[in-house]
């Protein structure tokens, strides 16, 4: 029986050009975590494998950093990074647990501030 639960950071926001840490935590189970997949909608970002360590998708190598822990750091954020992110925990013997995070990437405060004033 799957007794575990995934706690996530839930809905988060960050500034364009900045970075953000995506974190999930599996609790209430003694199951062994064998692998954690990080996905954005249908794109695979990275995999952290208990035996082999981190594997970053070639498409995201320049903008994704492993950690901290089983989390994932997204860098050089763009508005296109807005959306759903999933942490997928493969465990033994329980099976698969999935957590969801919604990230909203906002225009930087400088850009927002500048937009409020019209240049004569």
């Amino acid at each position: 029986m799957m007794t575990g639960t995934i706690e996530t950071t839930g809905n988060i926001s960050a500034e364009k050009g900045g970075s953000i840490i995506l974190q999930c935590h599996l609790s209430s189970t003694t199951a062994q975590v064998t692998q954690v997949n990080w996905e954005q909608q249908d794109q695979l970002l990275a995999i952290c494998n208990a035996d082999l360590g981190w594997h970053i998708s070639p498409s995201f190598k320049d903008r994704v950093a492993p950690g901290p822990g089983l989390g994932l750091t997204l860098q050089s954020l763009t508005v296109n990074d807005t959306g759903e992110y999933f942490c997928i925990y493969h465990t033994y013997p329980d099976g698969t647990y999935t957590g969801r995070i919604f990230l909203e990437v906002l225009e930087s405060s400088v850009a927002e501030h500048g937009a409020r004033f019209q240049i004569p």
């Epitope: 794109q43 695979l44 082999l52």
Partner: antibody, heavy 121, light 112 residues
């Protein structure tokens, strides 16, 4: 470190049977799919069979379907290949190989040293 | 089945010189998740195959950085920037996206 050790190969007559074993260590065997791949003398690599981590799905190359059976015993960290109705063209070195990442399609990272199967009268 | 075609099938190289092997697949290996399920293996004489490159361009652990993989979809390349004596053997590309997984014919690299 990850280690795969095959055994059970040998000389067998056409129509005969053999059971290959692959003892795994150094990783959580019960979490990974496993493959058998073979290599005929002087030839390239040919995939033979795959079994999911929990044994729920098994896939075979057309050339061995109905004759070979892949299985696993997670309590013993061991993979098996039961080979029946053997033919001369089954002569090869048989490798067991580990799925690289958990449930990430059908490719392998670590291979055993191989065991030789010779089918001849 | 996905057919994998390698070229050349034989590649004599002088030590210190670069080498390049091409692999073409009959079907697109780029999954919708953004990953190319294309691996490169090296089988040294008398040994079992060892993984060099996975996901088209990621070097496996412990693989020297003189090895690099590139390409996407149906066309892939393995490059060795400076061949060393220990690099001799047969190089195979393999697609791992579909059952059955399929290998190229192999490219035999030896020292001139």
């Amino acid at each position: 470190q990850v280690q795969l050790v095959e055994s059970g190969g040998g000389l067998v007559q056409p129509g005969g049977s053999l059971r290959l074993s692959c003892a795994a260590s150094g990783f959580t065997f019960s979490s990974y799919g496993m493959h058998w791949v073979r290599q005929a003398p002087g030839k390239g690599l040919e995939w033979v069979a795959f079994i999911r981590y929990d044994g729920s799905n098994k896939y075979y190359a057309d050339s061995v379907k109905g004759r070979f059976t892949i299985s696993r015993d997670n309590s013993k960290n061991t993979l098996y290949l039961q080979m029946n109705s053997l033919r001369a063209e089954d002569t090869a070195v048989y490798y067991c190989a580990k799925e690289m990442l958990v449930q990430d399609y059908y490719y392998m990272d670590v291979w055993g040293q191989g065991t030789t199967v010779t089918v001849s009268s | 089945d996905v057919v994998m075609t390698q070229s050349p099938l034989s590649l004599p190289v002088s030590p210190g010189e670069p080498a390049s092997i091409s692999c073409r697949s009959s079907q697109n290996l780029l999954h919708r998740n953004g990953i190319n399920y294309l691996n490169w293996y090296l089988q040294k004489p008398g040994q079992s195959p060892q993984l060099l490159i996975y996901w088209g361009s990621n070097r496996a652990s412990g693989v020297p950085d003189r090895f690099s993989g590139s390409g996407s979809g149906t066309d892939f390349t393995l490059k060795i920037s400076r061949v060393e004596a220990e690099d001799v053997g047969v190089y195979y590309c393999m697609q791992g996206l579909q059952i059955p997984p399929t290998f190229g014919q192999g490219t035999k690299v030896d020292i001139k």
